[in-house]
Interface confidence: medium
C-alpha cells in the first residue's frame, strides 16, 4: 500500500513537469484536480516550482469555480488549497487498495 | 471603511535597516494578498513584494531580494516589511496595498510612510 | 519582466478637452491593465482595472480600452480635479507588476 502510494506521489510529480508541455497530461492533470477539488501534489504551492508554469499561476482546474483564466493571478481563497496526492490517496485506500 | 496605515518609516544610514507596519482594517483580511510598493521622490511606483493570504507565498522585486523579507500576522490584521542592508537608492515612500488579485488592481492603498537611507 | 511604455510623457490641456493617455507593454497582457491617479503628496487611486472596467466611485468621464499590448485611458471632458498624474500597471506577469512611467496632466 505504502509503495503504491509512493509511486503515484512520484507520478503526479512527474506529470506536473509534463503538464506545459504535453495536452494529453494536462487534461488528465485536470480532470483529477477538477474531480477531487485538489491542487498540485502536496498543495497548490508544487505549481511554482514547475520552471515552465507562469509564477503567478496555477491550472484553471485548481480553482473552486473553474472559468478560463481563474488560475491566472490566484487567490488562495479562490482554489482548492489541498494537495491531490493524499486526497486521491484516500479514495484509493478506501475503495481499490 | 477600509484602512491602512504604514509606521515604521524614518532616516536611517546605509547598510542599517528598518521594519515597517501596515496596521489593516475595514475588510477580511486573510480574503486579501497584501503588497509593498514605493516611490522614490519624484519619481515614478516601484513594486516591491508581495504575500499571500496564508503567507505561503511570498516574492521581491529583485533590486531588494535578499534585503528585505515581507510578513503577515493575519491574528493582528498586520503587515511587516524588514529592510536591511538598506542603500541610497531605497529611499522612497513605501505603501502598503491591498490586492484582490485576478485583473481587479490594487484597490486600496495607505497613506505611506518614507524611508530615508542617507549618511 | 514585461516593460509598460505611457505616452506621451506629460501633457497640457484645458477644462473641457477630451483628452488620451497611451499605454503599451512588450508583450501581449490581454486585458491586465491598470490605471491611477496620482496627485501630489497623495498615493495612487485606482481608475480602471481590467482595461476597461471603472473601478467603485470613479467618475463616468473616465474609460478605458484596449487588450494585448495596446491599452488607453480616455478623459472624455477635463475638470480641475483631474490635473494629476496617471500611471497604467500590468498585472498579467505577477509578480513583478509593472508600471507605466506616469504621464502627468497639466493645466494650459
Known amino acids: 500500500r505504502d509503495k503504491v502510494m509512493s509511486e503515484f506521489n512520484n507520478n503526479f510529480r512527474q506529470q506536473m513537469e509534463n503538464y506545459p508541455k504535453n495536452n494529453h497530461t494536462a487534461s488528465i492533470l485536470d480532470r483529477m484536480q477538477a474531480d477531487f477539488k485538489c491542487c498540485g501534489a502536496a498543495n497548490y504551492t508544487d505549481w511554482e516550482k514547475i520552471p515552465s508554469m507562469s509564477k503567478n499561476r496555477v491550472p484553471d482546474s485548481c480553482c473552486i469555480n473553474v472559468t478560463v483564466g481563474c488560475g491566472i493571478n490566484f487567490n488562495e481563497k479562490a482554489i482548492h488549497k489541498e494537495g491531490c496526492v493524499e486526497k486521491i490517496g484516500g479514495w484509493l485506500r478506501k475503495n481499490v487498495l | 471603511q477600509v484602512q491602512l496605515v504604514e509606521s515604521g518609516g524614518g532616516l536611517v544610514k546605509p547598510g542599517g535597516s528598518l521594519r515597517l507596519s501596515c496596521a489593516v482594517s475595514g475588510f477580511t483580511y486573510t480574503d486579501y494578498f497584501m503588497n509593498w510598493i514605493r516611490q522614490a521622490p519624484g519619481k515614478g511606483l516601484e513594486w516591491v513584494s508581495y504575500i499571500s493570504n496564508s503567507g505561503a507565498i511570498k516574492y521581491y522585486a529583485d533590486s531588494v531580494k535578499g534585503r528585505f523579507t515581507i510578513s503577515r500576522d493575519n491574528a493582528k490584521n498586520s503587515l511587516y516589511l524588514q529592510m536591511n542592508g538598506l542603500r541610497a537608492d531605497d529611499t522612497a515612500v513605501y505603501y502598503c496595498?491591498?490586492?484582490?488579485?485576478?485583473?481587479?488592481?490594487?484597490?486600496?492603498w495607505g497613506q505611506g510612510t518614507l524611508v530615508t537611507v542617507s549618511s | 519582466d514585461i516593460q509598460m511604455t505611457q505616452s506621451p510623457s506629460s501633457l497640457s490641456a484645458s477644462v473641457g478637452d477630451r483628452v488620451t493617455i497611451t499605454c503599451r507593454a512588450s508583450q501581449s497582457i490581454s486585458n491586465f491593465l491598470n490605471w491611477y491617479q496620482q496627485k501630489p503628496g497623495k498615493a495612487p487611486r485606482l481608475l480602471i482595472y481590467g482595461a476597461s472596467n471603472l473601478q467603485s466611485g470613479v467618475p463616468s468621464r473616465f474609460s478605458g480600452g484596449g487588450s494585448g499590448t495596446d491599452f488607453t485611458l480616455t478623459i472624455s471632458s477635463l475638470q480641475p480635479a483631474d490635473f494629476a498624474t496617471y500611471y497604467c500597471q500590468q498585472s498579467f506577469s505577477n509578480p513583478p507588476v509593472t508600471f507605466g512611467q506616469g504621464t502627468r496632466l497639466e493645466i494650459n
Open positions: 496595498v491591498r490586492d484582490p488579485r485576478s485583473y481587479y488592481g490594487f484597490d486600496y
